[in-house]
């Protein structure tokens, strides 16, 4: 074969945001009959030749980027996508709420609110059985997400997480949950929690609607400003780690 | 794959437990394999106790952390366990079995030995 | 620690009948439960892992189910050897509890 080898998958089994102390296993996946895997941290000296690192507790030393690659015969790979290994429950939980409240009509306006009693800069939403979380950067000890013109498919669950920009990997718990409910439509939700993520989100940003690839990264945008997403049909396995997407502010 | 169990069979109460699980057909030293203990007292629920991994990890139940002890001699495929200062509340069927990450479940289990604490 | 809460304590179903038994995380466990049965005097036998994943050897009338917070195992057509005791397990960081279990009798 002419050329490099086409580049493996890498997996973080069930989530790439994992409480600390509880498992999680990265997963290696190239073509069959591999020869060699190597899977990394980057930013340390850290690696191992086997296609899984199994973690039977997280620690904060372990959160970070993660990839891999393959070797068949003397021809390695590309490496795999980059894998961002959050730990969470770092930090204490910020406080989630909504403005003007969490009963919303549909076609209204209503603003998250994530709030921390620390001088975090950072921020991620995520709604519960969405691919991944929406990130907003400020230099506050709050952050707004914004959702202008609600839908149906904006009812369901939200927690938001805090962290430092000093420490991307190290995140806070989670909030409490926080239930959006839309009136005024029955049209039911576009997905239930109990489903699994719908593979990709669309991001146009001159309409302000997210986009992001379904792959076990966690994604920064930093002009988005509302979290209208917009399932699409893929390819991509919805495997059975729930996945997370972001948003920028 | 076979584990077996080991034990005193009686012990008077504030004495220490010692446990011996020995086993075959598997490695300690084997990536991502671990061994852990789970009792059951008669006509009861089963609870788990501790748990140690190839990389000599190791996890407690919480509520009976500062009595436990696990240990392992992976050249001789045995995996220990100590509990001390016992009462008649420890009398029970103890159990070790075999856990592969990959599975996340206890696969194979030793056929258990009994506890009885009695003054 | 996660609470694993199962249900009935007990049942008792005749021979060719299908029971569910479920089992309830306390938070979020994934898929990472595994079920288990036992017959008096014996060790516990690996049914399910994975929630929904079939151990070896064990027939294709018992199916495991569910992910996050709740579970089921469902025997369909019983059999006069699924008589006995079961219980759930989670994996989804120590301590790896137990639920209290579920007695099958025959009716």
């Known amino acids: 074969q002419s050329g490099p080898l086409p580049k493996p998958s890498l997996q973080a089994l069930p989530s790439s945001l994992v409480p600390l102390e509880k498992p999680v296993t990265l997963r290696c996946q190239g073509p069959p009959g591999v020869d060699l895997y190597r899977l990394e941290k980057l930013s340390s000296s850290r690696y191992q030749d086997q296609a899984v690192l199994f973690i039977p507790a997280m620690k904060r030393s372990l959160a970070g980027r993660y990839r891999c690659s393959y070797q068949n015969g003397s021809l390695w790979s590309l490496p795999s996508d980059q894998l961002e290994l959050v730990a969470t429950g770092v930090f204490a939980k910020p406080s989630l709420s909504a403005q003007p409240g969490p009963a919303v009509s549909s076609g209204g306006d209503v603003t998250l609110q994530c709030q921390t009693r620390y001088g975090f800069d950072q921020f991620a939403l995520y709604k519960e059985g969405d691919p991944a979380p929406y990130k907003n950067p400020e230099r506050w000890y709050r952050a707004s997400f914004p959702i202008i013109t609600v839908t149906a498919a904006h009812s369901g669950t939200y927690r938001c997480y805090s962290f430092s920009s000093r420490d991307p990997y190290l995140w806070s718990a989670p909030s409490d949950p926080l239930e959006l409910v839309v009136t005024g439509t029955s049209v039911t939700p576009s997905r239930l929690p109990t489903e699994p993520p719908s593979p990709v989100a669309e991001f146009s940003e001159a309409t302000a609607e997210l986009t992001v690839s379904f792959t076990n990264e966690v994604f920064t945008t930093e002009t988005s400003r509302s979290i209208t997403a917009s399932p699409k049909e893929s390819d991509s396995p919805a495997g059975p780690a729930r996945q997370y997407y972001t948003k920028g502010n | 794959v076979t584990l077996k169990e080991s034990g005193p069979g009686i012990l008077q109460p504030s004495q220490t437990l010692s446990l011996t699980c020995s086993f075959s057909g598997f490695s300690l030293s084997t990536y991502g394999i671990g061994v852990g203990w789970i009792r059951q007292p008669s006509g009861k629920g089963l609870e788990w106790l501790a748990h140690i991994w190839w990389n000599d990890d190791k996890y407690y139940n919480t509520a009976l952390k500062s009595r436990l002890t696990i240990s392992k001699d992976t050249s001789n495929n045995q995996v220990f366990l100590k509990i001390a200062s016992v009462d008649t509340a420890d009398t029970a069927t103890y159990y070790c079995?075999?856990?592969?990450?990959?599975?996340?479940?206890?696969?194979?289990w030793g056929q258990g030995t009994t506890l009885t604490v009695s003054s | 620690d996660i609470q694993m809460t199962q249900s009935p304590a007990s049942l008792s179903a005749s021979v060719g009948e299908t029971v569910t038994i479920t089992c309830r995380a306390s938070?979020?466990?994934?898929?990472?439960l595994a079920w288990y049965q036992q017959k008096q005097g014996k060790s516990p036998q690996l049914l399910v892992y994975?929630?929904?994943n079939l151990a070896d050897g064990v027939p294709s009338r018992f199916s495991g189910s569910g992910s996050g917070t709740q579970f089921s195992l469902k025997i369909n057509s019983l059999q006069p050897e699924d008589f006995g005791s079961y219980y759930c397990?989670?994996?989804?960081?120590?301590?790896?509890?137990f639920g209290g279990g579920t007695k099958l009798e025959i009716k």
């Open positions: 994975a929630a929904t």
């Open positions: 397990q989670h994996f989804y960081g120590t301590p790896w509890t």
């Open positions: 079995a075999r856990v592969y990450y990959y599975g996340s479940s206890f696969d194979y």
């Open positions: 938070e979020n466990i994934f898929s990472i």
